[in-house]
Interface confidence: low
C-alpha cells in the first residue's frame, strides 16, 4: 500500500524559517504533488505549492522554494516576516497523485516544543484512494 | 489554441477492430497526461482509458481491460486507441481529453468520434 | 469506484431565473469534485473544479459547493447559452462521473 511521509524542520540559523520535506513510498509515477497548509487540500488547507514532474513548480507566499529532492520526495521552504512564527503550531499536508495508483495525502507539523533542526513525525490523516 | 481532433470512428460488427486517433495542438503534448472518455447514446461518460505523458502509465476500467489499448507518439503529437473485441455497449461517442495539471479532471476535450458497433 | 449520482436528472428553467444542480459521491471525496457543462451536439466543456473554483473564462454567475459527499452547481440569472447538459466528475483519483443533468428551456 502507497504511503506519504511529512517531515517538518525549523531552520536552526533561522527561527523564521522552515522547511517541508514530504515523500512518496510506494508503485506508479507521480503526476503532482501539492503542498498545503492548515488542512489538506480543499479541505480547509490553503495550497502553498504544486510540483510537475514535467512543467515545474507553482509556488505562493510564504513558500520560498520549492523543489523536487528526489523523483518521489520534494522540499518546500517557508519564510515568516513576522517577528513571532505561525508556523510553529501549523499542519503541512503533501497529497501525491500517483498514476495510475490515485491521490495519497498525509499531513504533519512541528511540536511547539521542537528544537531548532529537528523534524515532526510524519501525522497520517485519513487516506482516500479512489479506484 | 488547445486542439484536440479525433478520427477513425464508425460503423464495425460485433467482434471487430477500431482505431481512433486524436491530433493535438496548441499546447506541450508530451507534457500531459491524456485520456479518452466515451458518451453513450444514453448520454452517461465514463473513463475508458488514460496515459501518463510519457507514456510509462496507463489505466483501464475493468469493462476495457484486454480490449483496449491506449498509446501516445509525442513526436507526432497524436493519442491513440485501439479497440478490439468490440462490443454493442461499446457504441458511443468517443473523447479525446487532456488532463489539467493542477487538479485530476480534464480541462479540454476533442469533438469526438462516434463507433458504432453493430451487426 | 466511486459512484456520483446527480439530481435532477432533467429541469426547465427561463432565462432569468437562477438553479441549482446537486451531485452526491457515494464516498467521502473531500472538495475534489469538478463540472462540466456540454451544449447540444457539442463537446463538454471545463466549468468547475475543487468544487468551487471556476475554470479559466467561466462566468461569474456560475458557482459551485460542497464537500465530502455533497456538491452543488448553482447558475444565477440563467442565459440562454447555459441551457444544455452538466456534469460532475470526482478528480480524486481515477475519475468517474455523475449521470448528468440535463436544463432545458421552459
Known amino acids: 500500500t502507497p504511503e506519504v511521509w511529512v517531515q517538518v524542520q525549523m531552520e536552526a540559523t533561522e527561527l523564521s524559517s522552515f522547511t517541508v520535506h514530504c515523500g512518496f513510498l510506494g508503485p506508479g509515477s507521480i503526476s503532482l504533488v501539492t503542498v498545503s497548509w492548515g488542512g489538506p487540500d480543499g479541505a480547509g488547507g490553503t495550497k502553498l505549492a504544486v510540483l510537475h514532474p514535467e512543467l515545474g513548480t507553482r509556488q505562493w507566499a510564504p513558500a520560498r522554494q520549492a523543489r523536487w529532492e528526489t523523483q518521489s520526495s520534494i522540499s518546500l521552504a517557508l519564510e515568516d516576516s513576522g517577528a513571532s512564527s505561525p508556523f510553529a503550531n501549523t499542519t503541512f499536508c503533501c497529497k501525491f497523485a500517483s498514476f495510475p495508483e490515485g491521490s495519497w495525502e498525509s499531513c504533519g507539523s512541528l511540536p511547539p516544543s521542537s528544537d531548532p533542526g529537528l523534524s515532526a513525525p510524519p501525522t497520517p490523516v485519513p487516506i482516500l484512494r479512489a479506484d | 489554441e488547445v486542439k484536440l481532433v479525433e478520427s477513425g470512428g464508425g460503423l464495425v460488427q460485433p467482434g471487430g477492430s477500431l482505431k481512433l486517433s486524436c491530433a493535438a495542438s496548441?499546447?506541450?503534448?508530451?507534457?500531459?497526461?491524456m485520456s479518452w472518455v466515451r458518451q453513450t447514446p444514453e448520454k452517461r461518460l465514463e473513463l475508458v482509458a488514460e496515459?501518463?505523458?510519457?507514456?510509462?502509465?496507463?489505466h483501464y476500467p475493468d469493462n476495457v481491460k484486454g480490449r483496449f489499448t491506449i498509446s501516445r507518439d509525442n513526436a507526432k503529437n497524436t493519442l491513440y486507441l485501439q479497440m478490439s473485441s468490440l462490443k454493442s455497449e461499446d457504441t458511443a461517442m468517443y473523447y479525446c481529453?487532456?488532463?489539467?495539471?493542477?487538479?485530476?479532471?480534464?480541462?479540454?476535450w476533442g469533438q469526438g468520434t462516434s463507433v458504432t458497433v453493430s451487426s | 469506484d466511486i459512484q456520483m449520482s446527480q439530481s435532477p436528472a432533467s429541469l426547465s428553467a427561463s432565462v432569468g431565473e437562477t438553479v441549482t444542480i446537486t451531485c452526491r459521491a457515494s464516498?467521502?471525496?473531500?472538495?475534489?469534485l469538478a463540472w462540466y457543462q456540454q451544449k447540444q451536439g457539442r463537446s463538454p466543456q471545463f466549468l468547475v473544479y475543487?468544487?468551487?473554483t471556476l475554470a479559466e473564462g467561466v462566468p461569474s454567475r456560475f458557482s459551485g459547493g460542497g464537500s465530502g459527499t455533497q456538491f452543488s452547481l448553482k447558475i444565477n440569472s440563467l442565459q440562454p447559452e447555459d441551457f444544455g447538459s452538466y456534469y460532475c466528475?470526482?478528480?480524486?483519483?481515477?475519475?468517474?462521473f455523475g449521470g448528468g443533468t440535463k436544463l432545458e428551456i421552459k
Open positions: 481529453a487532456r488532463h489539467n495539471w493542477d487538479v485530476y479532471a480534464m480541462d479540454y
Open positions: 496548441g499546447f506541450t503534448f508530451s507534457s500531459y497526461t
Open positions: 496515459l501518463s505523458n510519457s507514456g510509462g502509465s496507463f
Open positions: 464516498e467521502n471525496v473531500n472538495s475534489y
Open positions: 475543487n468544487a468551487q
Open positions: 466528475q470526482h478528480h480524486y483519483g481515477n475519475p468517474t
